[in-house]
Amino acid sequence: MKVLQEPTCVSDYMSISTCEWKMNGPTNCSTELRLLYQLVFLLSEAHTCIPENNGGAGCVCHLLMDDVVSADNYTLDLWAGQQLLWKGSFKPSEHVKPRAPGNLTVHTNVSDTLLLTWSNPYPPDNYLYNHLTYAVNIWSENDPADFRIYNVTYLEPSLRIAASTLKSGISYRARVRAWAQCYNTTWSEWSPSTKWHNSYREPFEQH
């Protein structure tokens, strides 16, 4: 039994890191393998993660971690019984994939303005709380070409757009994702999408 693709890990910079790897053949990850991990810290203890299958030869492990700080470094040991298959380390702050924003809501009761709001996925004491920026994706269910991205580079988790920038009388969907420039993170997954019917009064045309 050998590791074909070494574990690569990403952290949500809060409490979970996810590590994925591939073996050289079909493997029952949960029965044959264990991933041991430990924060390099005087007051830390070793933890064991039981991996799950992720395709025939792929494995994935969700590591429960202490609140992350930038200096953290974890040792990782992948075991098959008594055999050490791979040894490595992981700095969560260097491999961050933020949590997805939640509670995306479209408020349509503001005069001819759409207000989209969502929740920051981090608590106020987390470093990323004040460092997230967002991308909002809006698309038409009727017209695949009607697809747009709004970059929200301010901290407030909201976006205002004129309803008239979208077509009236049809349904739209929106979703939002996050990233943090300070740690050069990847983008989060998209939030669940939300749907609304866009309607607004056309301005009266004079001839």
């Epitope: 810290f41 005087l42 007051l43 203890e45 971690m65 609140d67 700080v69 930038s70 004491d125």
Partner: antibody, heavy 115, light 109 residues
């Protein structure tokens, strides 16, 4: 807002015992290492003890064998049991959250050791 | 055990002046594990700088940290009246734990 609220200081005779408490709020207590740091009157800061998320502990040589740090994650609370107290243990004791450094501190509680 | 020595013991300056505080370690310290604190009379210490040069949340940009190895510096670019206090450096070591310097008092001249 992260808060650490301390209680339990007071006057004790040499050789006596005292238990300090620290209640945390505004953060996930169970995912953070916690510490006690003290400051003798007019002196600098001295690290006393720390406890990891899994219960691993460490002590300064000056208190080893006499002080015991513990935590109750269900109550978001940190404790310091101080036995065989000496005159040199007299100080303001602070609880703190942290790891390699201490990012949030309690208000401090005075422990006076005097006969 | 790593010993941190701060200098000067006392720094007498006027508001608006630049303050430079030194922290010297008896052996090399990882920059990731060097921090600075401010303490005012009757108050708990407050984290200013961690990782030798990163400002803690809410700390004004007139505070900056620098250095590596055994020599570290805290600089206050223009002293405000509320900056007069005692400043401590602190390090963490995987074997010895946590130690503080003896402090530098920044007082009004």
């Amino acid at each position: 807002e992260v808060q650490l609220v301390q209680s339990g200081g007071g006057l004790v005779h040499p050789g006596g015992s005292l238990r300090l408490s620290c209640a945390g709020s505004g953060f996930t207590f169970s995912r953070n290492a916690m510490f006690w740091v003290r400051q003798a009157p007019g002196k600098g800061l001295e690290w006393v003890s720390g406890i990891g998320t899994g219960g691993a502990t460490n002590y300064a040589d000056s208190v080893k064998g006499r002080f015991t740090i513990s935590r109750d994650n269900a109550k978001n609370s940190l404790y310091l049991q101080m036995n065989s107290l000496r005159a040199e243990d007299m100080a303001v004791y602070y609880c703190a959250r942290g790891r390699y450094y201490f990012d949030y501190w309690g208000q401090g509680t005075l422990v006076t050791v005097s006969s | 055990e790593i010993v941190l020595t701060q200098s000067p013991g006392t720094l007498s300056l006027s508001p608006g002046e630049r303050a430079t505080l030194s922290c010297r370690a008896s052996q090399s310290v990882s920059s990731s594990y060097l921090a600075w604190y401010q303490q005012k009379p009757g108050q708990a210490p407050r984290l200013l700088i961690f990782g030798a040069s990163s400002r803690a949340p809410g700390i004004p940009d007139r505070f900056s940290g620098s250095g590596s190895g055994t020599d570290f510096t805290l600089t206050i670019s223009r002293l405000e009246p509320e900056d007069f206090a005692v400043y401590y450096c602190q390090q963490y070591d995987h074997s010895a734990g946590w130690t503080f310097g003896q402090g530098t008092k920044v007082e009004i001249k």
